[in-house]
Interface confidence: low
């Protein structure tokens, strides 16, 4: 499907609004420190150039690849060396090495200030004064903080952001209308970013075979009535879309995602009965809806898997003829029968089945060898079932904050070398699994919990890769994508760790603690908890609970005092001394 001018082709396919939005996202994800105005200027220049190519595809430079055009544009930024250091060296390379170089310099934890939400009236004035700039600023600020955010989905978030302001800035109580919507968009956005980051890690670190296996399992759960060939086609198309987005090819990605949505809606009958309501929606909403669509009902009377995959004498013949197709069919058949399993569990089962066939098909009596293969699945299934049961019981007993604290202690003991901010962020997010999944019916708990944990642990892996400090984390992150969560679960107290020296400064608090939001207060306390465990890794639960209870009481007392700062100055050292004694 070749075109004389790729940039003209994408401009025509996507339309000016989406074209400009995607180019802004692409540039913001590559040059995360550049000011907004600089990016807008670059985007406008690219857009004007694209229009000349639409008018005449033979015009000068219109035949260049998008990577060449965009890379050349990024390399015109005057302050590249001062702002980005060695990333400026990318500009000395030719395509495709230059784009690969830009990709490698994407920063998952950029040193950017947290976004502060202005007063509602200030935001509404800015929205009304210049709606286009206001929305571009949203795309820019999200994209630079989340360099792997799924670009076409970010356009959908921006459309919802616009709709929230359009509605709420007219409302009688603007704040009551707007703030819950912005909170929802923020939380959904963070979740969307983390889910996409796992997809990109899967493709980049483990290859497209790993991603395709994930997609076969997930789509087979969603579309259990679809034939294997149909699922395979969707998997191939979906892999192309995500490979493009993860590779920075955002225009191609958005275009191909739109084609995939069109295909799914034209072929609902052979995919799923649940697609109808999605297919009536406009493009961005339709694609989002299709991605989030609930599982279709399982076909009635599906035959036992054992007949084709255990009892048949042709198992080894079928496996040898086309290994990946046979394993893909096994995964498809298993997944469509088990919406109650996590995708990661299904992939472990497929891996175990593959290992059994590799061993048995070379044996003297293959059939005898693999006859009990399904029995070997039992412990693999029970492990996540038990984990979910135990952790949901603990969550129900403790509530979210204290459940997070239990996980903070657990993970700090496992990998104490990891930085405190990372341990706090990751453990807080691990702790959110309780509220997200434990209220669900039994059949939905495991897929919710384990697949969410995979997303959170990927964040740990991504941050750790930037600054590696623990061999155990590196091992769990790199050895096997599907076994990451069991690998972390299996880690014990790190006996080799030398406890961190006590630093009174870490446990010195001030009156500003009292003006923090509840969430910020929790983060402060949890930061102190991690530092305590790093100082005393063998402290018991009871000891740590005692110290944390004293901490809460000390903060509460001083925040009620007339002279708060004096109270912190006086009571702080007493709290530190008492804590040291309690942990001695």
């Amino acid at each position: 499907d070749t075109h004389k001018s790729e940039v003209a082709h994408r401009f025509k396919d996507l339309g000016e609004e989406h074209f400009k939005g995607l180019v802004l996202v692409a540039f913001s994800q590559y040059l995360q420190q550049c000011p907004f105005e600089e990016h807008v200027k670059l985007v406008n220049e690219v857009t004007e150039f694209a229009k000349t190519c639409v008018a005449d595809e033979s015009a000068e430079n219109c035949d260049k690849s998008l990577h060449t055009l965009f890379g050349d544009k990024l390399c015109t930024v005057a302050t590249l060396r001062e702002t980005y250091g060695e990333m400026a060296d990318c500009c000395a390379k030719q395509e495709p090495e230059r784009n690969e170089c830009f990709l490698q310099h994407k920063d998952d934890n950029p040193n950017l200030p947290p976004l502060v939400r202005p007063e509602v009236d200030v935001m509404c004035t800015a929205f009304h004064d210049n709606e286009a700039t206001f929305l571009k600023k949203y795309l820019y600020e999200v994209a630079r903080r989340h360099p792997y955010f799924y670009a076409p989905e970010l356009l959908f978030f921006a459309a919802r952001y616009k709709a929230a302001f359009a509605e709420c800035c007219q409302a009688a109580d603007k704040a009551a209308c707007l703030l819950p919507k912005l909170d929802e968009l923020r939380d959904e956005g963070k979740a969307s970013s983390a889910k996409q980051r796992l997809k990109c890690a899967s493709l980049q670190k483990f290859g497209d075979r790993a991603f395709k296996a994930w997609a076969v399992a997930r789509l087979s759960q969603k579309f259990p009535k679809a034939e294997f060939a149909e699922v395979s086609k969707l998997v191939t198309d979906l892999t192309k879309v995500h490979t493009e987005c993860c590779h920075g090819d955002l225009l191609e990605c958005a275009d191909d995602r739109a084609d995939l949505a069109k295909y799914m809606c034209e072929n609902q009958d052979s995919i799923s009965s649940k697609l109808k309501e999605c297919c009536d929606k406009p493009l961005l909403e339709k694609s989002h809806c299709l991605a989030e669509v609930e599982n279709d009902e399982m076909p009635a009377d599906l035959p036992s898997l054992a007949a084709d995959y255990v009892e048949s004498k042709d198992v080894c013949k079928n496996y040898a003829e086309a290994k990946d197709v046979f394993l893909g069919m096994f995964l498809y058949e298993y997944a469509r029968r088990h919406p109650d399993y996590s995708v990661m569990l299904l992939l472990r089962l497929a891996k175990a089945y593959e290992a059994t066939l590799e061993k048995c098909c070379a044996a003297a009596d293959p059939h005898e060898c693999y006859a009990k293969v399904f029995d070997e699945f039992q412990p693999l299934v029970e492990e996540p079932q038990n984990l979910v049961k135990q952790n949901c019981e603990l969550f129900e007993q403790l509530g979210e904050y204290k459940f997070q604290n239990a996980l903070l202690v657990r993970y700090t003991k496992k990998v104490p070398q990891v930085s405190t901010p990372t341990l706090v962020e990751v453990s807080r997010n691990l702790g959110k699994v309780g509220a997200k999944c434990c209220k669900l019916p039994e059949a939905k708990r495991m897929p919710c919990a384990e697949d969410y944990l995979s997303v959170v642990l990927n964040r740990l892996c991504v941050l750790h890769e930037k600054t590696p400090v623990s061999e155990k984390v590196t091992k769990c992150c790199t050895e096997s994508l599907v076994n990451r969560r069991p690998c972390f679960s299996a880690l014990e107290l790190d006996e080799a760790y030398v406890p961190k020296a006590f630093n009174a400064e870490t446990f010195t608090f001030h009156a500003d603690m009292c003006t923090l939001s509840e969430k910020e207060k929790q983060v402060k306390k949890q930061t102190a908890l991690v530092e305590l465990v790093k100082h005393k890794p063998k402290a018991t639960k009871e000891q740590l609970k005692g110290v944390m209870d004293n901490f809460a009481a000390f903060v509460e007392k001083c925040c009620k005092a007339d002279d708060k700062e004096a109270c912190f100055a006086e009571e702080g050292p007493k709290f530190v001394a008492a804590s040291q004694a309690a942990l001695a």
């Epitope: 499907d1 034939e227 060939a229 072929n267 052979s270």
Partner: nanobody
């Protein structure tokens, strides 16, 4: 991975015949209905013909009825399109698809009918 590979296209004169083939791999070919679709330059894809999994039930677009014949050989995992009495308006890229989709999943084969 599902793969469809068309062949048999070419440049012919009006009134001539051509036989297109589509070799399938990566799925259980004999379990699926198949279609031929064509796309002329600057035009939307147009469904041409379909055949059920066993080969008994065949369907055609009005524009090709009586001139084109769809068939399949499940043993060879191949789909065919016999095109007779070709007209200039049959000029397009022809590609095969699973089911009755008009979404392009393969490269296709170019058919040009011109005097």
């Amino acid at each position: 991975q599902v793969q469809l590979q068309e062949s048999g296209g070419g440049l012919v004169q009006p009134g001539d015949s051509l036989r297109l083939s589509c070799a399938a791999s990566g799925f259980t070919f004999g379990s699926f209905g198949m279609s031929w679709v064509r796309q002329a330059p600057g035009r939307e894809p147009e469904w041409v013909s379909a055949i059920d999994s066993g080969g008994a039930d065949t369907r055609y677009a009005e524009s090709v009825k009586g001139r084109f014949t769809i068939s399949r050989d499940n043993a060879k995992k191949t789909l065919y399109l016999q095109m007779n009495t070709l007209k200039p308006e049959d000029t397009a890229v022809y590609y095969c698809t699973i089911g009755r989709s008009t979404s392009r999943g393969s490269q296709g084969t170019q058919v040009t009918v011109s005097s």
